[in-house]
């Protein structure tokens, strides 16, 4: 009987010879548990595991802690891969995080962090980032040092308010901080002066809600 090959991330999928964009089945580190993820095999050399995508407002991102933990949405469209998988994966080896952004005027930009990992659920999936480069602002729009993850039913931010309720979506809110890629999706011509939209402050300012976002990770030694 042929041994089942399992892949931890899209970099492993790519190196196995699968170089076409699409949905692949990945396996949790040190486990048989599986998860479906979208792999970008073309951008910047390929091998990118997509952990978040916004593009059309078809998926509700105002979700519970558990939903953000296990993931939701459709890997071929808008989705969140899942904090637990990403946490386990990024604690196995060093990963880079690339955040690709599109505005409503046809512009694109990115932020690349040379080291990214999420703490465990016990530490509220706190985000850790180092080494920012890219075109989406010289200052990190994810507050540094990193914050705990917060959702509508898991308030771990620093604000007296509940950032997830004010701004909608789960995110690494500060009080509430310069970004939220999981905010409300606003269509064109309704996307300005929105405090609760899809925000990346150091690229587009405070009230601008973006058209599309993708968060992707890849091993640093790819």
């Amino acid at each position: 009987k042929e041994e089942q090959i399992s892949f931890r991330d899209c970099a492993e999928v790519f190196k196995s010879g699968h170089t076409t964009n699409g949905i692949y089945t990945l396996t949790f580190p040190n486990s048989t548990e599986e998860i479906k993820a979208y792999c970008d095999m073309e951008a910047g050399g390929g091998g990118w595991t997509i952990i978040q995508r916004r593009e059309d407002g078809s998926v509700d991102f105002q979700r519970t802690w558990k939903e953000y933990k296990v993931g939701f949405g459709n890997p071929s469209g808008e989705y969140w891969l899942g904090n637990e998988f990403v946490s386990q994966l990024t604690n196995q080896q060093r990963y880079v995080l690339k955040i690709h952004l599109k505005d409503w005027e046809g512009n694109e930009a990115y932020s690349l962090y040379e080291h990214f990992y999420l703490s465990s659920e016990e530490l509220n999936y706190r985000i850790h980032l180092k080494g920012l480069t890219g075109t989406a602002g010289k200052i990190s729009s994810i507050s540094q040092p990193g914050n705990d993850f917060s959702t509508k039913d898991g308030d771990n931010d620093k604000c007296i308010c509940k950032c997830s309720q004010m701004l909608t979506g789960g995110w690494w809110f500060d009080a509430c901080g310069p970004s939220n890629l999981n905010g409300m999706y606003y269509p064109q011509r309704q996307n300005t002066n929105k405090f609760n939209g899809i925000k990346w402050y150091y690229w587009k300012g405070s009230g601008y809600s973006l058209k599309a976002t993708t968060m992707m990770i890849r091993p640093a030694d790819f």
């Epitope: 507050s143 620093k158 604000c159 007296i160 308010c161 950032c163 004010m166 701004l167 500060d174 009080a175 509430c176 901080g177 310069p178 002066n193 405090f195 402050y201 405070s206 009230g207």
Partner: antibody, heavy 120, light 108 residues
Framework: EVQLVESGGGLVQPGGSLRLSCAAS????????IDWVRQAPGKGLEWVAK????????YYADSVKGRFTISADTSKNTAYLQMNSLRAEDTAVYYC?????????????WGQGTLVTVSS | DIQMTQSPSSLSASVGDRVTITCRAS???????VAWYQQKPGKAPKLLIY???SLYSGVPSRFSGSGSGTDFTLTISSLQPEDFATYYC?????????FGQGTKVEIK
């Protein structure tokens, strides 16, 4: 009509205590947050304390922590500020204010204020 | 604690003048948590602007707010006699809540 009415101010000796009340009408305090803000004679506004009556969370300025206690009785629609170990620097007009915790995320209604004088 | 540094601390202006007051926060603030208040002598403060730029109900349109991040501004486009007062910015996001030190607008 929304109204906040403070009472309980007066002259007190250093080390003494006072309890201020903030009676609300025209709205239910459990749907809002309540703040106490003070203003020393000729000075600016200083936030003192906040309570979220529905959740029971309380927050204090460092200058009053351990001496002042904010509370609320939702059945009486009233908030309180218990002030112990009073000092001369606590002399001020004390205002209670309603804080809307969605939009406007701000203190939209204020009481008329009650004067607290701490002096021997 | 977040410091809210207002400037100027006082200014003299004439009726009809355009007046600008600035407030600088010591760290990044989400815009929805910044408000401006007006206070006249012996009276309680009144809310003018919330969310950094939204005009509160009943406030004349000559008042406007702008800014984001750490720098916020209150503008009175054409000063009226009833606008002579003290103005305060405030952040409501982090405990302790903090006010600016106030800007007194006086008649020239």
């Amino acid at each position: 009509e929304v109204q906040l009415v403070e009472s309980g101010g007066g002259l007190v000796q250093p080390g003494g205590s006072l309890r201020l009340s903030c009676a609300a009408s025209g709205f239910t305090i459990s749907d809002y947050w309540i703040d106490w803000v003070r203003q020393a004679p000729g000075k600016g506004l200083e936030w003192v304390a906040k309570i979220t009556p529905a959740g029971g969370y309380t927050y204090y300025a460092d200058s009053v922590k351990g001496r002042f206690t904010i509370s609320a009785d939702t059945s009486k629609n009233t908030a309180y500020l218990q002030m112990n170990s009073l000092r001369a620097e606590d002399t001020a007009v004390y205002y209670c204010a309603r804080f809307v915790f969605f939009l406007p995320y701000a203190m939209d209604y204020w009481g008329q204020g009650t004067l607290v004088t701490v002096s021997s | 604690d977040i410091q809210m540094t207002q400037s100027p601390s006082s200014l003299s202006a004439s009726v009809g003048d355009r007046v600008t007051i600035t407030c600088r926060a010591s760290q990044f603030l989400s815009s929805f948590g910044v408000a401006w208040y007006q206070q006249k002598p012996g009276k309680a403060p009144k809310l003018l602007i919330y969310g950094a730029s939204s005009l509160y109900s009943g406030v004349p349109s000559r008042f406007s707010g702008s800014g984001s991040g750490t720098d916020f501004t209150l503008t009175i486009s054409s000063l009226q006699p009833e606008d002579f007062a003290t103005y305060y910015c405030q952040q409501g996001l982090l405990s302790p809540l903090t006010f600016g030190q106030g800007t007194k607008v006086e008649i020239k």
